[in-house]
């Protein structure tokens, strides 16, 4: 014979649990049903009714199966410095995240509690490790031999351009400026000689640095919302 | 797939403590209210204690108000019930359930094996 359904409610078998979406009410010591996702418990089950279930109302919602008497609120809405990524339905919560430029220095369950924005690096200073959406940016010094002329929370140290004939040696906050040499070899007709450095570079690529025979004078500075740190501006 | 595994259940005499574990996996605690309950032979599921997923707040039920403490650990997904100045009346199976979102009304989705507490000299 095959096994009798129990319809909801009814008692279950000491020890044994209810079925997937159903709870144990210990009111009424019975097995009932759970409410759908944007739904709550209208009326509680008794011994002989099942529960009663209801929709949540606009701003609330439940996103599992449940027996709340009443839906969840939503969360505020999101600030200046934020997006909202998920909107507020009776099935979901809003969610906010940080806005480009920000991270998320407190987060809470879903989305961010409290947003900041990214530190940016001053001139010599470069990005060391690039901020996320949880954890800031963190700024280093310019090696010998490399510079960041920004003010950025992107822009990584570059290396100096190499000169022929240095006219301004380059620092940590700026780059070398080369001078033309003088006189050029005579060169094929129609070529046109223009005073430029060895090595060029875009000013978007990640460049790959020269090896360099000077010990490497990079650190990390120190993380931190306040104050800003060495090497960053809080603009 | 939700479980709840029950642990730290023993023999012990009147007067002294225990410590119960529920470690949970399949859900976070962020999101569920956590119960204990108990079962002796012969006798209905009565609700000991609660604490619930939003605010931390607890329920406690009469008959355990004042000896037994109820706890979690988000991090470890982990729900404790610390059982002092016990009573042979106590001795049940204990077990932890799912409460939903919230304390009240208490309820259980799901729960563990349990874990046996015999309180006797």
């Known amino acids: 014979l095959p096994a009798q359904v129990a319809f909801t409610p009814y008692a279950p078998e000491p020890g044994s649990t209810c079925r997937l979406r159903e709870y144990y009410d210990q009111t009424a010591q019975m097995c009932c049903s759970k409410c759908s996702p944007g739904q709550h418990a209208k009326v509680f089950c008794t011994k002989t009714s099942d529960t009663v279930c209801d929709s949540c109302e606009d701003s609330t919602y439940t996103q599992l199966w449940n027996w709340v008497p009443e839906c969840l609120s939503c969360g505020s809405r999101c600030s200046s410095d934020q997006v909202e990524t998920q909107a507020c339905t009776r099935e979901q919560n809003r969610i906010c995240t940080c806005r480009p430029g920000w991270y998320c220095a407190l987060s809470k369950q879903e989305g961010c509690r409290l947003c900041a924005p990214l530190r940016k690096c001053r001139p010599g200073f470069g990005v060391a490790r690039p901020g996320t959406e949880t954890s800031d940016v963190v700024c280093k010094p310019c090696a010998p031999g490399t510079f960041s002329n920004t003010t950025s929370s992107t822009d990584i140290c570059r290396p100096h351009q190499i000169c022929n004939v240095v006219a301004i040696p380059g620092n940590a906050s700026m780059d070398a400026v080369c001078t033309s040499t003088s006189p050029t070899r005579s060169m094929a007709p129609g070529a046109v000689h223009l005073p430029q450095p060895v090595s060029t570079r875009s000013q978007h690529t990640q460049p790959t640095p020269e090896p360099s025979t000077a010990p490497s004078t990079s650190f990390l500075l120190p993380m931190g919302p306040s104050p800003p740190a060495e090497g960053s501006t809080g603009d | 797939q939700v479980q709840l595994v029950e642990s730290g259940g023993g023999l012990v005499q009147p007067g002294g403590s225990l410590r119960l574990s529920c470690a949970v996996s399949?859900?976070?605690?962020?999101?569920?209210?956590i119960a204990w309950f108990r079962q002796a032979p012969g006798k209905e599921r009565e609700g000991v204690s609660c604490?619930?997923?939003?605010?931390?707040?607890?329920w406690y039920a009469d008959s355990v108000k004042g000896r037994f403490t109820i706890s979690r650990d988000n991090a470890k997904n982990t729900v404790y019930l610390q059982m002092n100045s016990l009573k042979p009346e106590d001795t049940a199976v204990y077990y932890c359930?799912?409460?939903?979102?919230?304390?009240?009304?208490?309820?259980?989705?799901?729960w563990g094996q349990g874990t046996q507490v015999t309180v006797s000299s």
């Open positions: 399949g859900f976070t605690l962020d999101y569920y209210a």
């Open positions: 604490i619930s997923s939003s605010d931390g707040s607890t």
């Open positions: 359930a799912d409460a939903g979102y919230q304390c009240t009304p208490l309820g259980y989705g799901s």
